[in-house]
Interface confidence: medium
């Protein structure tokens, strides 16, 4: 099965890397430092 991170979700993660967890069939983001949220779009103001 094609990895959705390379197609439909290739621009999903704003400040992070897209990751497809196949065994749960979910797309998630691994955020860059100081960022958080579903799409890594929120910045930690304390950082």
């Amino acid at each position: 099965k094609k990895n959705p991170c390379t197609a439909k979700f290739q621009n999903f993660c704003i400040h992070g890397e897209c990751r497809y967890i196949e065994n749960l069939e979910v797309v998630t983001c691994n955020c860059h430092q100081d960022y958080f949220g579903e799409r890594c779009g929120e910045k930690d103001l304390l950082a």
Epitope: R19, L24, E25, V26, T28, C29, N30, Y35
Partner: antibody, heavy 124, light 112 residues
Framework: EVQLVESGGGLVKPGGSLRLSCAAS????????MSWVRQAPEKGLEWVST????????YYPDSVKGRFTISRDNAKNSLYLQMNSLRAEDTAVYYC?????????????????WGQGTTVTVSS | DIVMTQSPLSLPVTLGDPASISCRSS???????????LNWFQQRPGQSPKLLIY???ERFDGVPDRFSGSGSGTDFTLKISRVEAEDVGVYYC?????????FGGGTKVEIK
């Protein structure tokens, strides 16, 4: 508000079948893996099954494998548990639980919301 | 299967006092890539379980800061800094690093 409402429990004879349902609302059901967990009377919690978002992957402990089948209908926002060849030891309250992604920088999945449960009694 | 062992089985506490629950797993819960899938649930009398702590030490939404989790590898602890009346119930640790997911036997917190 996340809501999970189980139904379908009841009294059934050993060897019988039952189908449990869980109606979900307040979130995008199709985006979440889902689980069933049970609790026998005066006992602890036991994981029963988990299903992936699209239903392609399902997981069971040995205690129910081959007898129970988890499924989902994303169009109806519903989760199901088909229970066959029921035994007295399957008597329990069955909870539907969402496998929620908790975002803290990297993903993390945990059973973040639970329904109130439906009671299954297996007895002759 | 991973066996989760909790102690004590019962924990009578005085209101305002601290409380500590131990959870030990039969093998390491560290997932090389994704951290440690160790969670704590609270089940008040007559209610369904609620997620309290996830990823060993992270409090879930709305959980008071008197609850804290710690530990690593195979040994984990849930602490309540000052027990309140609403904390009465059974607490379960749970691992979801490895299938089958497993729960501890539970620790019943009651007021003396």
């Amino acid at each position: 508000e996340v809501q999970l409402v189980e139904s379908g429990g009841g009294l059934v004879k050993p060897g019988g079948s039952l189908r449990l349902s869980c109606a979900a609302s307040g979130f995008t059901f199709s985006s979440y893996p889902m689980s069933w967990v049970r609790q026998a009377p005066e006992k602890g919690l036991e994981w029963v099954s988990t299903i992936s978002t699209g239903g392609r992957y399902t997981y069971y402990p040995d205690s129910v494998k081959g007898r129970f089948t988890i499924s989902r209908d994303n169009a109806k926002n519903s989760l199901y548990l088909q229970m066959n060849s029921l035994r007295a030891e399957d008597t329990a309250v069955y909870y539907c639980a969402r496998q929620g992604p908790i975002y803290y920088g990297n993903y993390y999945y945990a059973m973040d919301y639970w329904g109130q449960g439906t009671t299954v009694t297996v007895s002759s | 299967d991973i066996v989760m062992t909790q102690s004590p089985l019962s924990l009578p506490v005085t209101l305002g006092d601290p409380a500590s629950i131990s959870c030990r797993s039969s093998q390491s819960l560290v997932d090389g890539e994704d951290g440690t899938y160790l969670n704590w649930f609270q089940q008040r009398p007559g209610q369904s379980p609620k997620l309290l702590i996830y990823k060993v030490s992270e409090r879930f939404d709305g959980v008071p800061d008197r609850f804290s989790g710690s530990g690593s590898g195979t040994d984990f602890t849930l602490k309540i800094s000052r027990v309140e009346a609403e904390d009465v119930g059974v607490y379960y640790c749970s691992q979801s690093t490895h299938v089958p997911y497993t729960f501890g036997g539970g620790t019943k917190v009651e007021i003396k």
